[in-house]
């Protein structure tokens, strides 16, 4: 997977550390053509005008409908790799010619990432890390996946689950030395099928904060300490992924 | 102690291919990326590519990447960079660093000489 | 692929001067910026990571700053010892670029 890149659609840097939640998180990635609604730029999540709506996101601060996304990311934009065997495809060798959607300027492709796909986090992650993924769940899905990787550990597993028993979950947990923990489980279920969906993930001094289309939905202690070793995000599941970036703020 | 200690300087022909090593010590080598850079004499860096220990993923600098291929050992915590159809223009000092921000360290270099 | 630019190769200072050596993406990197220290006939070293983080045991005299396409390395009282190239990188997209480096010497 070369040349691929943060989205180039980041509203700068240098905020203050964000004060409480919800709330202003600052500068995150606004998103392949943003998203329509959000009353107060740069805001996070859904932050209205400082003053206004306070602890909560505005009315009407996440597009609901689908088309909410233009079809291809922003220039800039992680392409995904291409998909193979197993859960997260690895990229050992030079890719075959066509393994990647044709390309518009910085190497953005032009269509939408490949799932599973990896998120190369080559610092690791540390606190006000800022990570944003959006893209639309598949009509009839059953599951999306986000894998925190710590090496062949996973330190923040967040599975939304479409159809447990006849009832939606999001199962969080973490895997050590290939041992599952014990899991911690959130019935608030934010995702629709066939719908566009914003997912943050705030890295915390003890804790990742989720926040689902402008809106706080969970937090997860950390349980792998070494956050500096989390190096690698693995998103997977019945999704179409538009993009994925990181900044801090 | 993050320690990255990488093989010896080599004098190699013009054609052949050259595999430096880098040998990991001191933290978790499946849970940072390493990365190669190149440093010609006198002149400035550059970024040859990246390898996940963990699962092998690579993420190459376009401009090397018909030149050079990265692999590790996890049984021995080394990073391997092959170096093929050597030129002259590869002779230089190649560097593996680890990534991860906290530690961030370089090894010592290993100097490659390509001469007939 | 981005380009990093610092615009001075060689910075001339005196012991106890400030001095800032800049660094310029030719697009936005979102402040995923390192600075590194190579003083002759030594690996780099890295100073400062996410464009103002100071690596751990970096005197403070080091700081680094800076957002979107402009960042700076400043040294607040430059010591005999800071006699070094340094070089900028940005680790926002692959290939992970770095400047073409600045010399700094020491009058």
């Known amino acids: 997977a070369d040349n691929f890149s943060l989205h180039d659609a980041l509203s700068g840097s240098g905020n203050p550390n964000p004060q409480g939640w919800p709330g202003a998180w600052g500068n995150q990635p606004a998103g392949a053509g943003g998203y329509p609604g959000a009353s107060y730029p740069g805001a996070y999540p859904g932050q209205a005008p400082p003053g206004a709506y306070p602890g909560q996101a505005p009315p009407g601060a996440y597009p609901g409908a689908p088309g909410a996304y233009p079809g291809a990311p922003a220039p800039g934009v992680y392409p995904g790799p291409p998909s193979g065997p197993g859960a997260y495809p690895s990229s050992g060798q030079p890719s075959a010619t066509g393994a990647y959607p044709a390309t518009g300027p910085y190497g953005a492709p032009a269509g939408p990432l490949i799932v599973p796909y990896n998120l190369p986090l080559p610092g690791g992650v540390v606190p006000r890390m800022l990570i944003t993924i959006l893209g639309t769940v598949k009509p009839n899905a059953n599951r999306i996946a986000l894998d925190f990787q710590r090496g062949n550990d996973v330190a923040f597993h967040f599975n939304p689950r479409f159809n447990e028993n006849n009832r939606r979950v999001i199962v969080c947990n973490t895997k050590l030395d290939n041992n599952w923990g014990r899991e911690e489980r959130q019935s608030v279920f934010p995702f629709e099928s066939g719908k566009p969906f914003k997912i943050q993930v705030l890295v915390e001094p003890d804790h990742f904060k989720v926040a689902v289309n402008d809106a706080h939905l969970l937090q997860y202690n950390h349980r792998v300490k070494k956050l500096n070793e989390i190096s690698k995000l693995g998103i997977s599941g019945d999704i179409d992924l538009t993009s994925a970036s990181y900044t801090m703020i | 102690q993050v320690q990255l200690q990488q093989s010896g300087a080599e004098l190699v022909r013009p054609g052949a291919s050259v595999k430096l090593s880098c040998k990991a010590s001191g933290y978790t080598f499946t849970s940072s990326w390493m990365n190669w850079v190149k440093q010609r004499p006198g002149q400035g860096l550059d970024w040859i590519g990246m390898i996940d220990p963990s699962d092998s993923e690579t993420h190459y600098n376009q401009m090397f990447k018909d030149k050079a291929t990265l692999t590790v050992d996890k049984s021995s915590n080394t990073a391997y960079m092959q170096l093929s159809r050597l030129t002259s223009e590869d002779s230089a000092v190649y560097y593996c660093?680890?990534?991860?921000?906290?530690?961030?360290?370089w090894g010592q270099g290993t100097t490659l000489t390509v001469s007939s | 692929d981005i380009l990093m630019t610092q615009s001075h190769k060689f910075m001339s200072t005196s012991v106890g001067d400030r001095v800032s050596i800049t660094c310029k993406a030719s697009q936005d990197v979102s402040s995923v910026v390192v600075w590194y220290q190579q003083k002759p006939g030594q690996s780099p070293k890295q100073l400062i990571y996410w464009a103002s983080t100071r690596h751990t045991g970096v005197p403070d005299r080091f700081t680094g700053s800076g957002s979107g396409t402009d960042y700076t390395l400043t040294i607040s009282s430059v010591q005999a010892e800071d006699l070094a190239l340094y070089y900028c990188q940005q680790h926002y997209s692959t290939p992970y670029t770095f400047g073409g480096g600045t010399k700094l010497e020491i009058k």
């Open positions: 660093v680890n990534s991860n921000y906290e530690s961030g360290y």
